[in-house]
């Protein structure tokens, strides 16, 4: 069943910069993503950004840049001007909507004890942290290898020293997936890597949309940073909430995506489906 994950990160380089990563894990198509802070959208929260797969993005201060990372995940960079860093104790919520099936939302925050550049799970999760496990495991393997080499050297000085092949460790082994199941859903969680579509297929706008949607910057070169991040961008730890069960299924036989004026889709992209309607184009 579809799930929503939310991760809040403090940038290691700039302590005043935060990034909210949100993603949808499931078989549906997203028609709109809303990021808010201080609570859920429509329930006391304040909108920070709205991302439309075709019309682009709109954002409000202190949001600095909102962008699609994949077809099912987004990131929002925030600039904290205050010295007291109020973001550290703030709840950030992401609402994923698939019209008309429904909307679901999940929230997360950066724990006060978080190290810069890392994000810890929002609630205690009884699993060994994969980053520590990976580092310890790798250290153990190296120590064992060194010991074994010394052992071989002592016992078989007449033999040439065997060459140690470098270990091709997948950087995903260093990723901590600290999933905190919602109280509402106790279903077993599936492998998050299996459901994220890592193809990067955003839509861009050549001009500002008449409804006020801002033009998207060209960002095809950006690497995804969600759970399906490429090996070149390992994430050391990830705190996450998952949403309650909900369903998203693409209705067969619907019209192809509507492209408004000045809209350019990336080639070979099968973006979220467009439900019958005008997307606000007049």
């Amino acid at each position: 069943t579809p799930e929503v994950w939310v991760q809040v990160q403090m940038e290691a380089t700039e302590l005043s910069s935060f990034t909210v990563h949100c993603g949808f894990l499931g078989p549906g198509s997203i028609s709109l993503v809303t990021v808010s802070w201080g609570g859920p959208d429509g329930a006391g929260g304040t909108k920070l950004a709205v991302l439309h797969p075709e019309l682009g993005t709109r954002q409000w201060a202190p949001a600095r840049q909102a962008r699609w990372e994949t077809q099912s995940s987004i990131s929002l960079a925030l600039e904290d001007s205050g010295a007291s860093s109020p973001f550290a104790n703030t709840t950030f919520c992401c609402k994923f909507a698939s019209f008309p099936e429904g909307s679901w939302e999940s929230c997360g925050s950066l724990p006060p004890s978080s190290d810069p550049g890392l994000s810890a799970p929002p609630t205690p999760v009884p699993i060994l942290r994969a980053d520590l496990a990976g580092i310890l495991g790798l250290s153990g393997v190296l120590l064992f290898g060194c010991g074994y080499l010394l052992h071989l050297l002592r016992r078989q000085k007449h033999r040439p020293t065997p060459r140690l092949q470098p270990s091709h460790t997948n950087s995903q082994a260093l990723t901590a997936q600290a999933w905190a199941p919602s109280q509402a859903s106790q279903a077993a969680l599936h492998d998050p890597y299996a459901t994220i579509n890592t193809s990067f297929c955003p839509a861009t706008l050549d001009t500002a949309h008449p409804n006020g949607w801002a033009s998207l910057p060209t960002h095809a070169a950006h690497q995804p940073q969600g759970p399906a991040a490429s090996a070149s961008t390992p994430i050391l730890a990830r705190g996450s909430f998952v949403s309650v069960e909900n369903g998203l299924y693409t209705q067969a036989g619907e019209r192809p995506p509507h492209t408004g004026p000045g809209l350019t889709l990336f080639p070979d992209c099968r973006g979220p489906r467009a439900v019958e309607g005008r997307f606000g184009v007049r």
């Epitope: 859920p40 329930a43 609402k95 429904g102 909307s103 939302e105 859903s185 909430f241 369903g247």
Partner: antibody
Framework: EVQLVQSGAEVKKPGASVKVSCKAS????????IYWVRQAPGQGLEWMGT????????SYNQKFRGRVTMTRDTSTSTVYMELSSLRSEDTAVYYC???????????????WGQGTLVTVSS | QIVLTQSPATLSLSPGERATLSCSAG?????MHWFQQKPGQAPRLLIY???NLASGVPARFSGSGSGTDYTLTISSLEPEDFAVYYC?????????FGQGTKLEIK
Amino acid sequence: EVQLVQSGAEVKKPGASVKVSCKASGYTFTDYWIYWVRQAPGQGLEWMGTIDTSEHKTSYNQKFRGRVTMTRDTSTSTVYMELSSLRSEDTAVYYCARDFIITVNYPVVDYWGQGTLVTVSS
Amino acid sequence: QIVLTQSPATLSLSPGERATLSCSAGSSVNYMHWFQQKPGQAPRLLIYSTSNLASGVPARFSGSGSGTDYTLTISSLEPEDFAVYYCQQRSSLPFTFGQGTKLEIK
């Protein structure tokens, strides 16, 4: 307080059209979709369609395709459902409802209008 | 469209008893919503996404199921629980409701 207030009862002749309004208050109108459900006397519920109040997208039940039109007026926070080519079997109570957002660890609430009885009779 | 069949059509029970209402889908659906409707009133959401209680719904209500078979259970009936109950699927357009189960006092 969230409220959805619908227009009053209507009596129509076969072949005519009816336009039912649903005025929302107590929340940000464009934050929630509105869907319409009808219920014939003594019968069950039937989904007619949903409108995205923010983008004016609509999704209709194929059964009513071509006969139903849902629109919204953001200036008055009102949604309209128009049903044309009325026949006797369209006699029903028509409800508008605010679609709920499923949010982890927050209360999920739905809100409905009081219903509008539309009678189609010659 | 996906046809939802509720059973039984009418269920006669006494306060304090346990009620089990079933909803069978013509083809597999991902989840089920349940609504309660009392005479002269609009429906009210009880259970969303198969097993989650909507705001203000007493804990005696619970939902379960998967695939094509879903169940609404009321552990101990209160006088205000006697009403008509509808299941609804949103996995496939058009969204459909069951024909309803009338829960009446025996």
